[in-house]
Interface confidence: medium
């Protein structure tokens, strides 16, 4: 069976607003759901359409959506059909209409003392309540010879007199909302003793210290009185003026003149006309002081030739609204052409280089004029002054590669080395004119360099190859002091490079020749068996034809390399006892002993009372504590070499002897006992 699991339900709806009639169906097989309105199928429109099985209304319409809706679910296979509960809308609406004369039949028949009935043609559901207005002021029932009922759309004036003259309007409101009359009715019942407006004052805007004039005239028989009031209800007459309106003059024809206007004079001025009979007529006009603010600054603009660009000038705030125009070279721009003004915009079409320059946006009103310049640069593609050249640069000296270009605006130059962008660092520097400086040329700087010069209009590039002229140098320079082990074979290398392969030879510093057991083999000094006499100063000389010669001095020392006679051993000591770590080394020159304990060098001058290093190199620690445990390293060194050996020190608690242990029982590990 087909079952409705969400039923549509009658509901309130608002004209023009959204609504939804819900319908959800459960059935054993597929069903198709459609909607009926007063028995006829509902067709989908943009306004009213099926949403799933529910019916959605984008905007309820009181005419098209009145009636009874029903959701129908049909199984097309079995033909079974189920219908939901009926649902309808209680549509709330309100629609404006005019105020019309209901009685008498025509305006020509309206005379003083006749009954006048006006009708408010605003309709709605639910029925709205009405409010009447004369000249914008609400009318309430039972005042001044008129009858009005909020439920009733008629306004009756009985009898109608001149005091009822005015513009009649009505508004109505209901649960749906509010509407006011689309067309109002002017009732005019003449009474010559009533003041009537002949000339009403207008709002004025004046510049500071200028003059302002308000015109105001009324007519009546006998002539009406006229009075001017300022904001705070202060009367203005030629005899009594308020302090801030000393320069006010009221003329016989009712006009009010204010001279040398100041900010405190700005505000609302009221002109009041009073006839012999009837209500006073109050007319208002506002005096505004003209003002103009400053204009925001323009950022300089860079455009490319051939393009179309616009620069917007935001007018400054001001009263009255400032007028805006553009000037270039002192001439106001036209409203059409290639370079022209459109609204507040400066338009440059098909830009040419000659369009570059200063353009000025002007804004002006009564309060004054403001201007702001914008500097427009027309970008050009860079051109070459000097391209980079293939260059030979000397190693170790500064090298320069030129990249001199010109363009508008000033071009930006970047350099590439082997296609990699060069970022400025301690070795590379790009000058403002585009020249690249290599601060200290290295051999590996010999490669391809490319410079690119750019502006927004485009870029140019060129490349050059750098060849590095190597200087004559030792590679590496020989160590100035070297040691050779006595009675052993030794070699002292010396190599050099230059633009041409240099010749290398050794000689003794005193000029004497090398002994026969010492050979010079392609720059390597070879000692077959070192003797004490081999010690001394030697010179390595590298030379080639173009670059001359260079020398390196080496002092050779003959030494007996260090060996340890006594090395420290793994040592365990009772807490509070003394530890002795022995170390003795021999060599020539005589080695010095240093100790390192717990990863820090033990400075003999800062050891404190518990530690001491003997002349022979042994380390003694008195009154040992657990924190003295660790690895101790004996370091032996002289001017020729350095050697170290290490051993651990363990500090343990003295064991309490057990009954079974005799007094002579040895400890379970090697101990130093003091």
């Amino acid at each position: 069976a087909i079952v409705f699991i969400k039923q549509p339900s009658s509901q309130d709806a608002l004209q023009g607003r959204r609504a939804l009639l819900r319908c959800e169906v459960e059935a054993p097989g597929p069903v198709h759901v459609y909607w009926l309105l007063d028995g006829a199928p509902v067709q989908d429109t943009e306004r009213r359409f099926a949403q799933g099985s529910s019916l959605s209304f984008a905007a309820v319409d009181r005419l098209q959506d009145s009636g009874t809706f029903q959701c129908v679910a049909r199984d097309d296979v079995t033909g079974e059909e189920a219908r939901s509960a009926n649902a309808s809308f209680n549509i709330k609406w309100i629609e404006a209409g005019p105020v019309v004369l209901k009685h008498p039949a025509s305006e020509a028949e309206i005379q003083p003392q006749t009954q006048v009935t006006l009708r408010c043609h605003i309709d709605g559901h639910p029925r709205p309540t009405y409010q009447w207005f004369r000249d914008g002021t609400p009318l309430s029932d039972g005042q001044s010879n008129h009858t009005v009922s909020s439920k009733e759309r008629n306004l009756t004036l009985r009898p109608a007199g001149p005091e009822h003259s005015g513009l009649y309007s009505c508004c109505a409101h209901s649960a749906f909302g509010q509407a006011c009359s689309s067309q109002n009715f002017t009732l005019s019942i003449a009474d010559e003793s009533f003041a009537r407006v002949v000339l009403a004052p207008q709002d004025v805007v004046v510049a500071r210290y200028e003059e302002a004039m308000f015109h105001c005239q009324f007519s009546a028989q006998p002539p009406p009185s006229l009075q001017w009031l300022f904001e705070d209800e202060t009367p203005i007459t030629n005899r009594s003026r308020p302090p801030h309106l000393r320069r006010a003059t009221v003329f016989a024809n009712g006009s009010l003149l204010l001279t040398q206007v100041r900010p405190r004079n700005a505000g609302i001025y009221r002109c009041i006309g009073q006839g012999q009979r009837g209500p006073p007529i109050i007319l208002e006009a506002t005096l505004h002081l003209a003002e103009i603010e400053d204009m925001p600054l323009f950022e300089p603009r860079v455009f490319t030739a051939g393009s179309e660009e616009r620069v917007t000038c935001l007018p400054p705030k001001g009263l009255p609204e400032p007028s805006v125009w553009w000037e270039h070279a002192g001439v106001r721009l036209p409203t059409h052409g290639r370079v022209y003004q459109k609204g507040h915009e400066l338009v440059l079409a098909n830009i040419a280089e000659s369009d570059a320059g200063v353009y000025t946006c002007h804004a002006a009103n009564l309060a004054g004029q403001r201007r702001q310049d914008v500097n427009i640069t027309v970008a050009t593609v860079p051109s070459w002054l000097k391209k980079p050249q293939d260059s030979q640069l000397e190693e170790g000296k500064p090298g320069y590669l030129d990249c001199l270009t010109q363009a508008t605006p000033k071009p930006t130059v970047v350099w590439y080395r082997n296609q990699m962008l060069i970022s400025e660092d301690s070795r590379f520097e790009v000058f403002k004119n585009g020249t690249l400086r290599i601060n200290s040329v290295e051999v590996y700087d010999g490669t391809w360099y490319r410079c690119m010069s750019s502006t927004p209009a485009g870029s140019i590039e060129a490349q050059a190859r750098v060849q590095v002229l190597e200087k004559l140098k030792f590679t590496p320079p020989p160590q100035p002091q070297q040691c050779m082990e006595f009675d052993k074979e030794a070699t002292v290398p010396c190599s050099a490079t230059g633009r041409e392969k240099p010749t290398i030879k050794w000689e003794r510093a005193d000029g004497s020749s090398l002994p026969e057991w010492v050979t010079d083999n392609a720059g390597t000094l070879h000692f077959a068996r070192v003797t004490r006499d081999d010690a001394g100063n030697y010179t390595c000389i590298a030379s080639n034809g173009p670059q001359g010669q260079i020398r390196a001095h080496v002092q050779l020392t003959v030494a007996v390399f260090i060996t340890f006679k006594v090395e420290p051993e793994r040592t365990t000591v009772y807490q509070g006892h003394t530890a002795l770590l022995q170390c003795e080394a021999q060599g020539d020159p005589k080695p010095l002993i240093q100790w390192k304990g717990k990863d820090r060098i033990l400075d003999p001058t800062k050891l404190g009372p518990r530690m001491h290093i003997f002349q022979n190199g042994s380390l003694v620690i008195h009154d040992v504590a657990p924190e003295d445990s660790g690895r101790y390293t004996c370091i032996a060194g002289n001017s020729c070499n350095i050697k170290h050996t290490e051993a651990p020190l363990y500090v343990v608690d003295k064991p309490v002897p057990e009954e079974s242990e005799g007094p002579g029982s040895p400890p379970p590990y090697k101990m130093i006992q003091t």
Epitope: V3, F4, I5, K6, Q7, S9, S10, Q11, D12, L14, E26, N90, K92, A175
Partner: antibody, heavy 119, light 108 residues
Amino acid sequence: QVQLQESGPGLVKPSGTLSLTCAVSGGSISSINWWSWVRQPPGKGLEWIGEIYHSGSTNYNPSLKSRVTISVDKSKNQFSLKLSSMTAADTAVYYCARDESGYDYFDYWGQGTLVTVSS
Amino acid sequence: EIVVTQSPATLSLSPGERATLSCRASQSVSSSYLAWYQQKPGQAPRLLIYGTSSRATGIPDRFSGSGSGTDFTLIITRLEPEDFVVYYCQQYGTSPRTFGQGTKVEIK
């Protein structure tokens, strides 16, 4: 006569997830009704959490939608609520309830279970 | 969402008197979509009225509902001792369905 019975822990830790189950007896959860969860903080009014149909279709209160999951187990004739990221403001009596067929008011309610959020 | 406001928060009356409970919605609710519930201390709510004016099964005829648009009323014509509890109204025409904050009817 349809009866509903809520079950689940009475205490949940802050930022934890609440899991409640509602067992339906005296009627089938596969009837044409929708099944809802409603909660009531101590001394306050009622708040609808969401509903489920036996097909698995759900509707949730937008104010809780990001934290709520309602599921149905037709074989056990029960439906469940999971509410994540619990805070002290979620302390309430949680009721399960049945919608009248086709309409969104509640004709049957469980007796409710108090859930306190505290560490 | 539609906000539902009940007034007064507390109503003090004597047994046998007539109680008038008000329920106002922040926007128009179809008369088919308003329900009233009664809740006794420590118990779940119990359906009294649905569709603004239809009494649920087993509800005595001293309870009646009326209203349309945004203003709805529950009237208890002669208060019995067991009627001095809390009453909630609920709109279910627009999702999410929402409840009023409740009116407590207490013995004067």
